[in-house]
């Protein structure tokens, strides 16, 4: 079982007398049917709450909204609806809050069916103030923000226009026409993708990706035959169909759209999908779907240029486009990823990655855990954990995976022992390592949050009753202990806390129910007084992460490079603060054949770790498309994986020799790309 | 089977400082903490602090902070103390162990491995 | 720094006898506690780990249980070669180490 409250946990002395005083009751005066919350900045302590209630009438939707602000982590709440008029913000496009510390907020109102656009209301001091400003189109997305430069705004209308704003939203530009989706990249570049017949939908396949680099006042286009594209790390990948059949091949550029090379990934048809898993600067998670209604497809992993791709994982689970799929990157250690697969009896397994998708596992049965009825042999099992998809299947699982970058090794998750996933009730895990060890933390499923950079772990359980008790633990999730933050019940929608785990308030929102009347109700819990002091330097010991070995020279290289981290002490009870900053120390690995993938043209076998040429390619010369040209590879058959820095060991080489060729590919190339202006 | 093989007996002087030695063989050196352990005539033990020969990470006990370092050669698979300022009382035997591990927490498991001892005199 | 206090300082026993040394910790370390042997001009030996693993090659007549902040050593049946100090030690803050236990024979 998992641990509780006993004489064996070191309790935290009078911790319900230093709660009771850093708790924070807010009643508001309304009950309406929703209410979203939104952090605005960071460590400014405001919080924007809009509630929203509306019928749809059979010509119009009829409903109210209303607005407060906190700027003390949601202790205290003041009704700022005055602000905007009291008027109907309309949910569905959110609260559009600027890129870091902007201190911009962008609100979109729902106006009467005549109106000639849209109306919004600005704010760039926090939501202190709103100016409303009246659009010249009805918006159809919300209002996205240049991740360079917060003033910058672009939006689609409902008639397909894309318009920009350069002075947060004040005024307005249409910049073209016919527009499907567009995305922001860097350096203020806009990429989009226009239709030239009848719509977005009709015209899949054969749409035009565009860019431009001035805001609209010049464009270019970089691809035809476009089915989609996406943005990832440094990678712009566009899908464009073949001029033969139906089907589609991912292209991928990284001179934002100048020149491209067909990233040698298997086509898909009509009916299947790509999907971009996770990007970084140095590599991509690339799912491809498998033909027919599979509900799975494979993993590839990419190289450096995003053109050559390892397969990673089979069968791995992916319901549809758009659907669900329970890959998680644990942001708590370099490297680490998790997801489900679907085997062949149907059932679905959770698999871990250590070193970025080169080797998948299962999951280390959790320590005084039992293998539950999926398992075969009572002894040997794995945890499977509950992701995206459990949740969209109804089961009985509050939450999604946690792990946080500056909580250094942890990660929190839904889980069941056994041979595959279960419909059971689940238990609350935690890993302190990143994943290769894990303990059960809480019994039967529960809402979690991580405070303090992991000096604080708060949980609730998840019930249909009402609840009053929160628990929380300050050595990662050992020990628990118990507060009653009311002594009335309430009925619990979500926990609240500040985007990146560096806060100590939690807030617990819900809605109280009497006779006559339901009231939204938010109780926001300050732990500064459980930690009472600074944390120094003897509360932090070394740990070496992705530790397997001792023994092994080499133990804890993953991606050419082992790092050790100073971790909080379990038992030392601090804060490590607002400005913490996780220390670690790099040091460099040997190379070895794991720091390397194969090129194109070669393969893995399995359980190999050298690299082989693929069978209907040997004796071939090795010619593909890079650039838009025709290259003749000279390759021993290995790369170096994406973002390893291992040095000297084992150094296989290529070399690359130009047949300066144009290559016929049915994609735009690069000198019939036309330049316009506007 | 790994081994700490420890420097001689030294004799020192009111003040002075004194350098004791650790070498380890048979066994990877450089993926555990060596700790520093002395213990006075007819006393208990005493932890002084340790050092990881990875990045040289060293910490020490708050009551020798600043008149102890401990630094390691990964090269040569040692690992050094020096403690300055001595005095009558820093008269003992002084010990490095290894600090066992089963997971990336070094200092957690107990020390599996110990030198044979160096015996420090501190006498005017 | 936490302190760790052990009893009793000096033990009397006879061959055979099942013995006990307890050590406490002035606060939580869960279970990141080692014991050791040590004999007159020898160095310790390490016994237990994590409160109650035995490493390798000491003899399973010693255990370790406990956690949080009380600990204890037992000697199921004392044998000749087992009349030594005992320290224990924690791991969880700096390193310290208990007084010491002195098993003499009775």
């Known amino acids: 079982s998992a641990p509780g409250e006993d004489e064996e946990c070191g309790r935290v002395r009078d911790f319900v007398a230093k709660l009771a005083n850093n708790t924070h009751q807010h009643v508001f005066d309304d009950l309406r049917a929703s209410v979203s919350l939104s952090w605005v900045g960071d460590s400014t302590g405001v919080i924007l709450v809009l509630t929203t209630f509306h019928v749809p009438l059979v010509i119009m939707t009829f409903g109210q909204s209303k607005l407060y602000r906190s700027e003390d982590y949601g202790k205290n709440f003041k009704d700022i609806t005055d602000l905007i008029n009291n008027t109907f913000i309309r949910t569905e496009f959110g609260m559009a809050i600027g890129p870091e510390n902007s201190g911009k907020v962008v609100l979109t109102a729902e106006v009467s069916g005549g109106s000639r656009g849209g109306r919004i209301f600005r704010s760039s001091d926090f939501a202190k103030n709103f100016v409303q400003t009246d659009l010249p189109f009805h918006p159809l997305t919300q209002m996205m923000y240049s991740p360079q430069n917060s003033d910058y705004l672009l939006a689609l209308s409902t008639e397909n226009g894309l318009w920009v704003s350069k002075n947060f939203g004040g005024k307005w530009e249409e910049i073209h026409k016919a527009v499907c989706l567009a995305k922001w990249g860097s350096d203020n570049t806009i990429f989009f993708t226009t239709y030239a017949n009848g719509s977005c939908k009709a015209d899949l396949g054969a749409l035009e990706l565009w860019r431009t680099s001035d805001l609209g006042k010049s464009f270019k286009t970089i691809g035809v035959k476009i089915y989609s594209f996406g943005l990832g790390g440094r990678f712009l990948f566009a899908s464009v169909m073949a001029d033969k059949d139906t089907t589609r091949r991912i292209h991928v550029s990284t001179d934002q759209g100048d020149t491209w090379s067909m990233a040698q990934l298997p086509s898909v048809g009509q009916e299947q999908f790509y999907s971009i898993l996770a990007a970084n600067d140095d590599m991509v998670f690339m799912h491809v779907d498998e033909p027919g209604d599979t509900g799975f497809g494979t993993i590839f992993t990419s190289d450096d240029r995003g053109i050559v791709y390892s397969k990673s994982l089979d069968r791995h689970l992916y319901t549809t486009t758009g659907g669900e799929t329970d890959f998680t990157n644990v942001t708590s250690l370099r490297g680490v990823y998790i997801t489900s697969v679907l085997s062949e009896d149907n059932s679905i397994q959770t698999m871990i990655t250590f070193d970025q998708g080169g080797r998948w596992t299962h999951l280390r049965k959790p320590e005084n855990s039992e293998c539950d009825a999926t398992a075969k042999n009572k002894n040997e099992c794995s945890l499977h954990i509950h992701a995206s998809y459990s949740i969209s299947q109804k089961l009985n699982v509050p939450m999604a995976p946690l792990s946080e970058p500056n909580a250094v090794g942890i990660v929190i998750a839904h889980g069941s022992v056994g041979d595959a996933i279960s419909v059971m009730v689940p238990d609350v895990y935690i890993s302190d390592d990143g994943g290769y060890s894990w303990t059960k933390m809480l019994e039967g499923p529960h809402y979690y949050t991580i405070l303090d950079s992991g000096g604080i772990i708060v949980a609730i359980e998840h019930s249909s009753r009402p609840i009053n008790v929160i628990k929380f633990s300050t050595d990662e999730g050992q020990c628990w202990q118990t507060y009653t933050f009311t002594r009335d019940p309430i009925y619990f929608t979500g926990l609240a806390s500040e985007p990146g785990a560096r806060s100590m308030n939690i807030s617990i929102w819900g809605f109280t129910e009497s006779f006559l009347t339901s009231q939204w109700v938010s109780y926001t819990i300050d732990f500064k007084d459980i930690l009472e002091r600074n944390c120094e330097e003897k509360d932090y010991t070394i740990w070496l992460a992705h530790s397997t070995d001792p023994e092994d020279y080499e133990d804890g290289c993953i991606l050419g490079y082992k790092e050790q981290f100073l971790r909080l002490r379990k038992s030392s009870v601090c804060q490590n603060g607002r400005d913490y900053v996780v220390t670690k120390q790099p040091s460099i690995c040997l190379c070895s054949l794991e720091d390397f993938l194969c090129d194109f043209g070669y393969y893995r076998p399995e359980n190999d770790s050298k690299c082989v040429e693929q069978p209907e390619l040997k004796g071939h010369d090795l010619e593909f498309c890079l650039y838009g040209r025709e290259e003749h590879l000279t390759t021993n058959g290995y790369r170096k994986i994406p973002g390893d820095k291992c040095q000297g060991g084992v150094n296989p080489v290529r070399e690359v020799k130009d047949l300066k060729k144009k290559c016929t590919s049915n994609f735009l190339s690069p000198e019939k790309q036309n330049s316009k202006s506007n | 089977q790994v081994q700490l093989v420890q420097s001689g007996a030294e004799v020192k002087k009111p003040g002075s400082s004194v350098k004791v030695s650790c070498k380890a063989s048979g066994g990877t050196f450089r993926n555990y903490a060596i700790s520093w352990v002395r213990q006075a005539p007819g006393q208990g033990l005493e932890w002084m602090g340790g050092?990881?020969?990875?990045?040289?990470?060293?910490n020490y006990a708050q009551k020798f902070q600043g008149r102890v370092t401990i630094t390691a050669d990964e090269s040569t698979s040692t690992a050094y103390m020096e403690l300055s300022s001595l005095r009558s009382e820093d008269t003992a035997v002084y010990y490095c162990a290894r600090q066992g591990r089963k997971t990336g927490y070094y200092y957690y498991y107990g020390m599996d491995v110990w030198g044979q001892g160096t015996t420090v005199t501190v006498s005017s | 720094d936490i302190q760790m206090t052990q009893s009793p300082s000096t033990l009397s026993a006879s061959v055979g006898d099942r013995v006990t040394i307890t050590c406490r910790a002035s606060?939580?370390?869960?279970?990141?506690l080692a014991w050791y042997q040590q004999k007159p001009g020898k160095a310790p030996k390490l016994l237990i780990y994590?409160?109650?693993s035995l490493e390798s090659g000491v003899p399973s007549r010693f255990s370790g249980s406990g956690s949080g902040t009380e600990f204890t050593l037992t000697i199921s049946s004392l044998q000749p070669d087992d009349f030594a100090t005992y320290y224990c030690q924690q791991a969880d803050g700096h390193i310290t180490f208990g007084g010491g236990t002195k098993v003499e024979i009775k």
């Open positions: 994590k409160a109650s």
């Open positions: 606060q939580s370390i869960s279970s990141w």
């Open positions: 050092i990881i020969p990875i990045g040289g990470w060293a």
